[in-house]
């Protein structure tokens, strides 16, 4: 089953003048009528190139969406084609008809010539269920770490009121199914699951009815587990620096921890003309590590005030937790105080990298 | 067993630093919170902050902010609130409570729930 | 900061009485209201979350309903057990903030 589907009953045609601009008419369709919506020219005049815009987008023309300057036609329409639909001139964006179009599950009755008055007969009052917010319900994946609460809501209306029912991976879903249970809420038209699991994972359903018709909505859940690592440090940083003589630098390193992570930073030297030891290991000297009153948050900095030439070379941090290792370097790069900044960036281009 | 331990408090002078612990066990802490709530003598619950270990991130009381910072060793399951910058009106006992998020759908807010709590450890913070 | 306010800021009441305390917040927080009970000397004990959802473990005689800005506390026959000091918190805002309390007391 796809992220997010809503079930649609197909079934017929009505045909419905514009409303006067300025006027928002609210229409109500049968599924699988065919919704035609009028909008001619206000006072009569020249209308100009129009654009046809359902929920704030453009409407593209298909086998399904026929469109016209002046009218717009749905065939087939589903609850999908519910919505706020306008024309507006192309060019100025202004709105020449304004539509509120609901399509209920009741199929038409009556004449189908008679357009205006099927719309009527089909009436707000009675009707099958729609979605009071469906702008709230695009979000269809819900990513949860194990041990939190989910929540799934389905709020929607209809006369008479809807029941709503649940389905985990399309069968019938109740508390007995979960260790922990479920907590419904039919006045909120919520599913509560405490201390979710791996095993909740999938794909839970929202069946909404009554007499008139359904509508359903299926949301993935996908419960995340820790799994332990080393710590991660951002891409990019520490990042090479080039600095005059005298003036002062930042290297910057951000880590990403489970476990409290023990964050140094090195600077290699050169011992006897050589920068690493027998064992290939590098040499280095502590500038900075964690002491007593140290946070974090000053550790994943290193300042270098009134810079020297001594003070080029390699810079490293380190961080290290009960998983492991990891460590990015950079390098720093010292330029006489006379040499111009343009002079400066070239040579921090040759150290880049 | 959910237990939440707090240590630390104690009496410390204005302008000076302290570090309360909150030993969490019972649970999977790195899936979870912990919410620091104080509670000045004979006043009502005042919420300090929260870290939240899936991602290490923190948030704070404006009362707080910028003198507290909420910190954790998930190899040890347990969180730290740093204090530093005392002052008189910080005297409370303090405590720490598990918290766990309520995702919803619907929602672009995640509900936080504190459901349960520490013993409470006092700072007192006078010269 | 969105604030809370309870009411009544103590009542008394004896064993047995239908007890209502309300909690109402400077804007819309939606469901999203817990309420904490704590005696004298204890951490907060939490009974209700997302304004109406029981708690594991706390008894049937607490209830909690509302959204938006207006929530109420009800305990439905008081025990001796629940003489304590009530607290509503709301947490869609930030930073998550407690009403002032709630005492009831034995009358």
């Known amino acids: 089953e796809s992220l997010g589907t809503e079930q649609r009953v197909v079934g017929r045609a009505a045909e419905v003048p514009g409303p006067e601009p300025g006027q928002q008419e609210q229409l109500v369709f049968g599924s699988g009528d065919a919704v035609e919506l009028s909008c001619p020219p206000p006072g009569g005049g020249p209308m100009g190139p129009t654009v046809w815009v359902k929920d704030g987008t453009g409407l593209v023309p298909s086998e399904r969406v026929l469109v016209g300057p002046q009218r717009l036609q749905v065939l087939n329409a589903s609850h999908e084609d519910s919505g706020a639909y306008s024309c507006r001139q192309r060019l100025t964006q202004r709105v020449l008809c304004h539509f509120s179009v609901r399509v209920t599950d009741a199929p038409s009755s009556g004449d189908d010539e008679d357009g205006e008055d099927e719309a009527e007969d089909t009436g707000v009052d009675t009707g099958a269920p729609y979605w009071t917010r469906p702008e709230r319900m695009d979000k269809k994946l819900l990513a949860v770490p194990a041990a939190n609460t989910v929540r799934f809501r389905c709020p929607a209306a209809g006369n008479p009121t809807p029941s709503i029912s649940w389905l985990k991976n399309g069968r019938e879903f109740r508390g007995e199914h979960r260790i922990g249970g479920i907590k419904l809420r039919h006045q909120q038209w919520s599913l509560v699951m405490e201390s979710v699991v791996p095993s909740d994972r999938g794909n839970y359903t929202c069946v909404v009815e009554n007499k008139f018709g359904s509508i359903r909505q299926t949301y993935t859940l996908d419960v995340l587990e820790r799994s332990p690592h080393r710590p991660i440090l951002q891409a990019g940083l520490p990042a090479n620096q080039t600095a005059v003589l005298g003036s002062d630098v930042e290297f910057h390193c951000k880590v990403y921890s489970d476990a409290q992570p023990h964050i140094q930073w090195l600077k290699h030297v050169e011992v006897n003309g050589s920068k690493v030891g027998p064992d290939g290991t590098p040499y280095v000297t502590v500038l900075k590590t964690a002491g007593a009153n140290t946070t974090d948050k000053e550790l994943e900095v290193l300042s270098l005030h009134n810079v020297t030439f001594e003070d080029a070379g390699e810079y490293t941090c380190l961080a290290g937790n009960s998983i492991g290792f990891s460590h990015h370097s950079a390098w720093l790069v010292v330029l006489p105080a006379e040499e111009e900044l343009v002079e400066a960036d070239e040579a921090g281009s040759v150290y880049a990298g | 067993e959910v237990q939440l331990v707090e240590s630390g408090g104690g009496l410390v002078q204005p302008g000076g630093s302290l570090r309360l612990s909150c030993a969490a066990s019972?649970?999977?802490?790195?899936?979870?919170?912990i919410s620091w709530v104080r509670q000045a003598p004979g006043k009502g619950l005042e919420w300090v902050g929260r870290?939240?270990?899936?991602?290490?991130?923190?948030n704070y009381a404006d009362s707080v902010k910028g003198r507290f910072t909420i910190s954790a060793d998930t190899s040890k399951n347990t969180a730290y609130l740093q204090m530093n910058s005392l002052r008189a009106e910080d005297t409370a006992v303090y405590y720490c409570?598990?918290?766990?998020?309520?995702?919803?759908?619907?929602?672009?807010?995640?509900?936080?729930?504190?459901?349960?709590w520490g013993q409470g450890t006092l700072v007192t913070v006078s010269s | 900061d969105i604030q809370m306010t309870q009411s009544p800021s103590s009542l008394s009441a004896s064993v047995g009485d239908r007890v209502t305390i309300t909690c109402r917040a400077s804007q819309d927080v939606d469901t999203s209201l817990a309420w904490y009970k704590q005696k004298p000397g204890k951490a907060p004990k939490l009974l209700i979350y997302s304004a109406s959802f029981l708690y594991s473990g706390v008894p049937s005689r607490f209830s909690g309903s509302g959204s938006g800005t207006d929530f109420t506390l009800t305990i439905s026959s008081l025990q001796p057990e629940d003489f304590a000091t009530y607290y509503c918190?709301?947490?869609?805002?930030?930073?998550?903030?407690f009403g002032q309390g709630t005492k009831v007391e034995i009358k």
């Open positions: 409570a598990r918290t766990y998020g309520i995702y919803d759908i619907y929602e672009k807010y995640t509900e936080y729930v504190m459901d349960y």
């Open positions: 870290y939240w270990a899936w991602d290490g991130s923190t």
């Open positions: 019972g649970f999977p802490f790195t899936s979870l919170g």
């Open positions: 918190q709301q947490s869609t805002g930030h930073p998550q903030t």
